[in-house]
């Protein structure tokens, strides 16, 4: 057998088993698992006298290694004294020594609970530059404890952590905080908080969760857009699965219909996101009539690391219907931007919230990328509203100064569309917007209100107006805010819109 250094263990009695009037007491030290012979055991008894006896070594049958016990008997004021057993094993090394310091007896104690907590990620699921690990050592009988942090089983520098102890009633708690750089945390190492107490070791370990554990995988199922449903007459629905860990098993998306009828062939797309997660979309064509008649479609998401399948279903929105009101406006010319103009379209008081917005010029639909449309928001009443914004160039309005904002919505009649035309220069083009004069006062609609009155002339505040409180001397509904134009103007001029 090769040379093996001993493991050393203190041998003590339970304090409650020692009579209070005992004048002497015996304690011991076990050295085990060493090879070859011998070990030398010496005792430090402090100020007390003691007699020692080392028992002959015995052979451990399985390994052929040795074990021996040394006993120390002390008399006098032993209860307050600490004793050190020093074991030397020269075959391991000329200076191989293991010291164990302990008292005569062990008291009953409540062991600690050890738990590591970790600081949060930011809102986007990303780790901050430093990560804090908090080791909570709680509920133990007060006494000396030693906390060591390990990285993959190797001792970490004590100066990287801070510790504090509190006592509540008869029990104590200690917490140790370790600060790590993001680089170390992300390197997939295991961090252990190791607590030594009353000769026992307690620990808890943690590491960055493996990417194979889906971080809150979510699934969403969209309804067909009104444009696809009523204009193109080729509606599709999309099942979107986000926050998947890449390349860790296949995600399956399965379509079905509540009626049990067969579904069409779907198309699938996978996209790696910048945060390292995978997004999977499956698009299913549905029948226009099936959808309008209220068929329910289901998307079932399965993945090896999901505890159970995710089910999402969609169907035509129920509830009251209301057609949209459409208002289109052109903003006045802005100094330095003579060759560009912004058109705005307020579409409001429609139900349900599904709506498609298009802009047309010269009877041709402009690409969706040309305009920006908000998500439907609830009005103060029961309907919804959206704003759509389109930038047009001088070349376009000089070719034909009429732009159309069209809303596609199931409640609009006769053909599920409502549209309004707007001109950049209404005076020249004879359009329906107001004539352009320098304003001295502007009326703005507060963004929190239900919507604009039907007679409103616009929805975008004059670029140089600022919002004031509603004024009693100004005509209009009380919920409208007043904006005062800073530049001088010759005649009163009103503009109603969002501040």
């Amino acid at each position: 057998a090769s040379t093996q250094s001993p493991s050393v263990f203190p041998l003590t009695r339970c304090c409650k088993n020692i009579p209070s009037n005992a004048t002497s007491v015996t304690l011991g030290c076990l050295a085990t698992g060493y090879f070859p012979e011998p070990v030398m055991v010496t005792w430090d008894t402090g100020s007390l006298n003691g007699t020692t006896m080392t028992l002959p070594a015995t052979t451990l049958t399985l390994s052929g290694h040795y074990a021996t016990i040394s006993l120390l008997t002390v008399s006098g004021a032993w209860a307050k004294q600490m004793f050190t057993c020093r074991v030397a094993h020269t075959p391991s090394s000329t200076d191989w020594v293991d010291n164990k310091t302990f008292s005569v007896c062990s008291r009953d104690f409540t062991p600690p609970t050890v738990k590591i907590l970790q600081s949060s990620c930011d809102g986007g699921g990303h780790f901050p530059p430093t990560i804090q690990l908090l080791c909570l050592v709680s509920g133990y009988t007060p006494g000396t404890i030693n906390i060591t942090w390990l990285e993959d089983g190797q001792v970490m520098d004590v100066d990287l952590s801070t510790a504090s102890t509190t006592q509540e009633g008869e029990l104590a708690s200690t917490q140790s905080e370790l600060t790590l750089s993001q680089k170390h945390w992300l390197s997939d190492r295991t961090y252990t908080c190791q607590v030594t107490y009353q000769g026992h070791t307690f620990e808890d370990s943690t590491k960055k969760c493996a990417d194979s554990n889906p971080r809150g995988v979510s699934a969403y199922l969209s309804r067909p857009s009104p444009f696809d449903l009523f204009i193109r007459k080729s509606p599709t629905i999309t099942c979107l699965v986000v926050d998947l860990a890449p390349s860790k098993g296949t995600v399956n998306l399965t379509w079905s219909r509540a009626s049990g009828k067969p579904v069409n062939h779907s198309t699938r797309k996978e996209e790696k996101q910048r945060n390292g997660t995978l997004t999977v979309t499956s698009t299913l064509p549905v029948g226009t009539r099936d959808w309008i008649e209220g068929e329910t479609y289901q998307c079932r998401v399965t993945h090896p690391h999901l505890p159970r399948a995710l089910m999402r279903s969609t169907t035509k929105t129920s509830g009251p219907r209301a057609a949209p009101e459409v208002y289109a406006f052109a903003t006045p010319e802005w100094p330095g931007s003579r060759d560009k103009r912004t058109l705005a379209c307020l579409i409001q008081n429609f139900m349900p919230e599904d709506i498609s917005v298009q802009w047309l010029h010269n009877e041709v639909q402009l690409p969706d990328a040309r305009h920006s449309t908000t998500q439907p928001r609830k009005t103060k009443g029961s309907g919804f509203f959206v704003f759509s914004r389109l930038e047009v160039t001088r070349a376009e309005w000089e070719q034909k100064d009429e732009f159309i904002c069209r809303a596609v919505h199931e409640a609009a009649s006769p053909s599920q569309t409502v549209q309004r035309a707007v001109s950049v220069n209404p005076g020249l083009a004879g359009g329906s917007a107001q004539s352009q004069r320098a304003p001295d006062r502007v009326l703005c609609h507060s963004g929190q209100q239900q919507g604009l009155p039907r007679a409103a002339g616009g929805s975008v505040p004059h670029p140089r107006c600022h919002c004031g409180a509603g004024r009693a001397d100004w005509p209009g509904p009380p919920e409208l805010d007043v904006c005062v134009e800073e530049a001088e103007g010759e005649a009163p001029w009103t503009w109603t819109g969002l501040c």
Partner: antibody, heavy 119, light 107 residues
């Protein structure tokens, strides 16, 4: 007290193999990583790599991948550095150094083993 | 790899002098820089860790400062036994690298 005791000097020929030992005492061997550092005659210190004494996993600097191998004999609290196919440029003093994780603090060093490679 | 540039290469001082040894990193390494002393025919000895944290058993005349990429080891009042080579070491980025050293001599 913590002590790292390295084996004695070695004189080798090119192409031979050398195995240096580093025996640790005064602490729990498997709790601390062990680094190996090379110092060529009259030169500075060059980190070769380290071995996790708990898992046995070795990490090498780019320059020391291939002919160099770290190993352990945990029962004897000893770490080893083996250099195969020795070259003249391996002539140096090799130090073992105990490490505090995770920022490579080398708090205790062995006395060094001088390896001379000469034909 | 991060390069550490130490200056001066050699420093000749009189006992009692206050000296400063510089170490510059090729990129920021926060405070993860350690200093070692190596006397002739001896192994290196840890003097300072994390740029400024003192080590038990090291005389108080040794101190460190700096963060980012510029670091300084100061010896308040040089003693004759301080002769040797002083190395800085990057502990921040893999692999750990050492500076070429500053040799301290006594006039």
């Amino acid at each position: 007290q913590v002590k790292l005791q390295e084996s004695g000097p070695e004189l080798k020929k090119p192409g031979e193999t050398v195995k240096i030992s580093c025996k640790a005492s005064g602490y729990t061997f498997t709790n601390y990583g062990m680094n190996w550092v090379k110092q060529a005659p009259g030169k500075g210190l060059k980190w070769m790599g380290w071995i996790n004494t708990n898992t046995g996993e070795s990490t090498y600097a780019e320059e020391f991948k291939g002919r160099f191998a770290f190993s352990l004999e945990t029962s004897a609290s000893t770490a080893y550095l083996q250099i195969n196919n020795l070259k003249n440029e391996d002539t140096a003093t090799y130090f073992c150094a105990r490490e505090l994780r995770p920022y490579h603090v080398m708090d205790y060093w062995g006395q060094g083993t001088t390896v001379t490679v000469s034909s | 790899d991060i390069e550490l540039t130490q200056s001066p290469a050699t420093l000749s001082v009189t006992p009692g002098d206050r000296v400063s040894l510089s170490c510059r990193a090729s990129q920021s390494i926060s405070v993860y820089l350690h200093w070692y002393q190596q006397k002739s025919h001896e192994s290196p000895r840890l003097l300072i860790k994390y740029a400024s944290q003192s080590i038990s058993g090291i005389p108080s005349r040794f101190s460190g400062s700096g963060s980012g990429s510029d670091f300084t080891l100061s010896i308040n009042s040089v003693e004759p036994e301080d002769v040797g080579v002083y190395y800085c070491q990057n502990g921040h980025s893999f692999p750990p690298t050492f500076g070429a050293g500053t040799k301290l001599e006594i006039k």
